[in-house]
Interface confidence: low
């Protein structure tokens, strides 16, 4: 089973070790790529594994790969190992873990890197219906096209730390098109996308980006961030570079840049409380449900990003957090059709400045079933039934107990015709001895 | 397929490289691995290449050995061989799971 | 230094009957079962039977099976055939190339 677009097109969040241990004497290692997750054609990447001071030799395994992919001697102080791929190709794109050596054994595996490889297809076209220019309130379509069929398209924005939706079409079922649909718009949505097309037989392998289009909201005076710009730059893409920079900020922009990061922080405390409490009421009334009857679960399994680059330098990954605006629960979603087979996932940084609403995509012509989209993959959290998540594990070289995926407390919640899934996770480790960020939460929106 | 060439009478110390040549194969997706045996003996485990193009060897091998590659072509340099080099020597695909061998190329080290 | 032991040297089975050769290994193999097993007969590089310990290669008869975890490994010949008369390896993996090693290998020879 191919693992879902939401995995692995959370464009550089790759995917950091959890904070509980497996069955084993030795912890897993920590396995993170350098520069970013999302590589395009051609460019360098690093992929370091940390294990512990104890470690004699450090080991990479390619799923899918019929031996071990590398081997490498631990750097001093022999807690990590390094593996250079000096030019990125399809070759090595997919999923990888790593593991180490200590005198006691080998440890577990590292949770998987998904390496994804831009730059595969000829870039799609991103335009925005009716128009780039849209008043607060109103609706606008973002529509991605490429110039051969493709059954899977993203849409992301920059300065993000995630993609925000993808729409993968039934099998077989090619487009030349998507619509990501945005109603009612808010401050929030204005910014710069980028969109991605893909074809389902390899969802490691991209498009090249389509060029930027900006989207302007006007008419908003709510918004407490300054408003979008219309500079765009492309170096800053969402190849190589982070899509949201974790960089030192320029001085006359410091205190703004507090300002919101506060404002945003509290906005999503107080929404986070409000939707818990809500959340708790539903449960409370619906106590006598099965769990069968039950259309979402909220969980909590152990989860935790990589660790940031020792030389500090930018990365992708950060810590989720809650990025729900109240009014956009699926607000705007009307007689969605329950086969519609499109996944959402909506992330944002504590450090982001560009929170992002909740929005859905459908596909043009096109009724995708459910058990044509796949389902997500470790690296958006295990949402899997006892089926699926047998099928995933089958698919993987390295099966892992799905036990410790069990949902701890597990609460339910309708939403229309989707399910809200939420699962907390933890700030990645420091090691600069920086205090963590704090814990965050985020949610991922799936139709079904 | 594979094909190793290179093998010949030399003598002690006199480097000798051996080629491997790959047809149908992507070095790009796969390791590469050594194995030599002497006449009537067993299989000796000499090294590998990954995909990347880093080399590892086995403990005896290390120093005396040195495998590099291009696109199409697996290398074994010989530094200094010795009477005890005498074997024919086998590359084969992949790392552990050797799925794929060549017939071997003859190497006789003699003064 | 990783070291595998493979038992009997040399074993005869009638047709039909059933061949075990075991491979022992002094230290646990990586993930408990990077171990391969491989056919050779005169004058041909080896086959590939098993790989990771159990599973059985493209191609070969379901007769050979191997089984085993940790340090203690074993390659099943089931129904032998005539056929089956050569030479088996084991392999093993415990780290970094310098320790992946070719077991002494077991000559079967079928009346």
């Known amino acids: 089973m191919i693992p879902t677009f939401t995995a692995l097109l959370c464009l550089g969040l790759s995917l950091g070790p959890r904070t509980h241990m497996q069955a084993g004497p030795l912890p897993k290692p920590t396995l993170w790529a350098e520069p970013g997750s999302v590589i395009s054609w051609g460019n360098s990447v690093t992929i370091w594994c940390q294990g512990t001071l104890e470690a004699r030799e450090y080991r990479l395994d390619k799923e899918e790969s019929p031996a071990p992919w590398d081997r490498q001697n631990p750097l001093e102080p022999k807690n990590k190992a390094r593996f250079s791929i000096p030019s990125m190709t399809e070759d090595y794109a997919g999923r990888y873990r790593c593991y180490y050596r200590s005198p006691v054994g080998w440890s577990q595996p590292s949770d998987p890197l998904e390496l994804v490889m831009t730059g595969a297809y000829s870039k799609p076209t991103l335009s925005a219906l009716p128009s780039p220019l849209v008043t607060s309130g109103k609706s606008v379509t973002l529509l991605c096209q490429s110039r051969s069929p493709m059954d899977t398209f993203l849409l992301i924005k920059e300065r993000a730390a995630h993609p925000l939706l993808h729409l993968r079409s039934e099998h077989g079922a090619q487009q030349h098109q998507a619509e990501f649909p945005m109603s009612p718009v808010t401050s929030v949505h204005g910014g710069t996308y980028r969109c991605f097309s893909s074809h389902g037989f390899s969802h490691y392998l991209l498009s090249h980006p389509s060029d930027p289009l900006e989207l302007i909201v006007s008419g908003s005076l709510e918004d407490p961030r300054p408003s979008p710009t219309r500079s765009v730059s492309t170096a800053a893409g969402p190849e190589d570079q982070p899509l949201m920079p974790t960089g030192s900020v320029p001085h006359s922009g410091l205190r703004r840049h507090w300002e919101v990061l506060i404002g945003v922080l509290v906005v999503s405390i107080l929404l986070l409380s409000l939707l818990l409490f809500l959340l708790l009421q539903h449960w409370r009334q619906g106590k006598h449900r099965t769990l069968a009857q039950r259309q979402a679960d909220f969980q909590r399994p152990p989860g935790a990003a990589e660790p940031e680059p020792k030389d500090g330098g930018l990365q992708r990954r950060s810590s989720p957090a809650a990025d729900v605006q109240g009014e956009n629960f699926c607000a705007a979603v009307k007689n969605t059709q329950p086969e519609d087979g499109v996944e959402m996932d909506t992330r944002q940084s504590p450090h982001d400045e560009d929170p992002q609403a909740v929005t859905y995509a459908k596909v043009k012509h096109s009724r995708p079933r459910r058990e044509m989209a796949s389902p997500p993959s470790p690296l958006s959290g295990e949402f899997l039934d006892t089926k699926d998540r047998q099928a995933e594990e089958d698919r993987q070289m390295d099966t892992e107990a799905a036990a410790s995926e069990a949902p701890q407390d597990v609460t339910y919640a309708q939403l229309h015709s989707f399910t809200l899934r939420q699962k907390a996770t933890e700030p990645p480790p420091s090691q600069e001895g920086a205090s963590p960020a704090e814990p965050s939460v985020y949610a991922t929106l799936a139709i079904h | 397929s594979l094909e190793e060439s290179g093998g010949r009478l030399v003598t002690p110390g006199t480097p000798l490289t051996l080629t491997c040549t790959v047809s149908?194969?992507?070095?790009?997706?796969?390791?590469m691995t050594w194995v030599r045996q002497a006449p009537g003996k067993g299989l000796e485990y000499i090294g590998f290449?990954?995909?990347?193009?880093i080399a590892g060897y086995a403990t005896w091998a290390k120093g005396r050995f040195t495998i590099s590659k291009t696109s199409t072509t697996v290398d074994l340099k010989v530094t200094s061989p010795t009477t005890e080099d005498t074997a024919t020597y086998f590359c084969?695909?992949?790392?552990?799971?050797?799925?794929?061998w060549g017939q071997g190329t003859l190497v006789t080290v003699s003064s | 230094e990783l070291d595998l032991t493979q038992t009997p040297a040399s074993v005869s089975a009638a047709v039909g009957g059933t061949v075990t050769i075991s491979c022992q290994s002094s230290?646990?193999?990586?993930?408990?079962?990077?171990l391969s097993w491989f056919q050779q007969k005169p004058g041909q590089p080896p086959k590939l039977l098993i790989f990771?310990?159990?599973k059985l290669a493209s191609g070969v008869p379901s007769r050979f099976s191997g089984s085993g975890s940790g340090t203690q490994f074993t390659l099943t010949i089931s129904d032998v055939q005539c056929d089956d008369a050569a030479s088996y390896y084991c392999?093993?993996?415990?780290?970094?190339?310098?320790?992946?090693?070719f077991g002494g290998g077991t000559e079967v020879v079928v009346k």
């Open positions: 290449i990954n995909i990347v193009g």
């Open positions: 149908g194969i992507d070095l790009n997706k796969y390791a």
């Open positions: 230290e646990s193999l990586y993930k408990k079962n990077y």
């Open positions: 392999l093993g993996d415990y780290t970094n190339g310098r320790d992946t090693t």
């Open positions: 084969a695909r992949n790392w552990i799971r050797l799925d794929l």
């Open positions: 990771e310990a159990s």
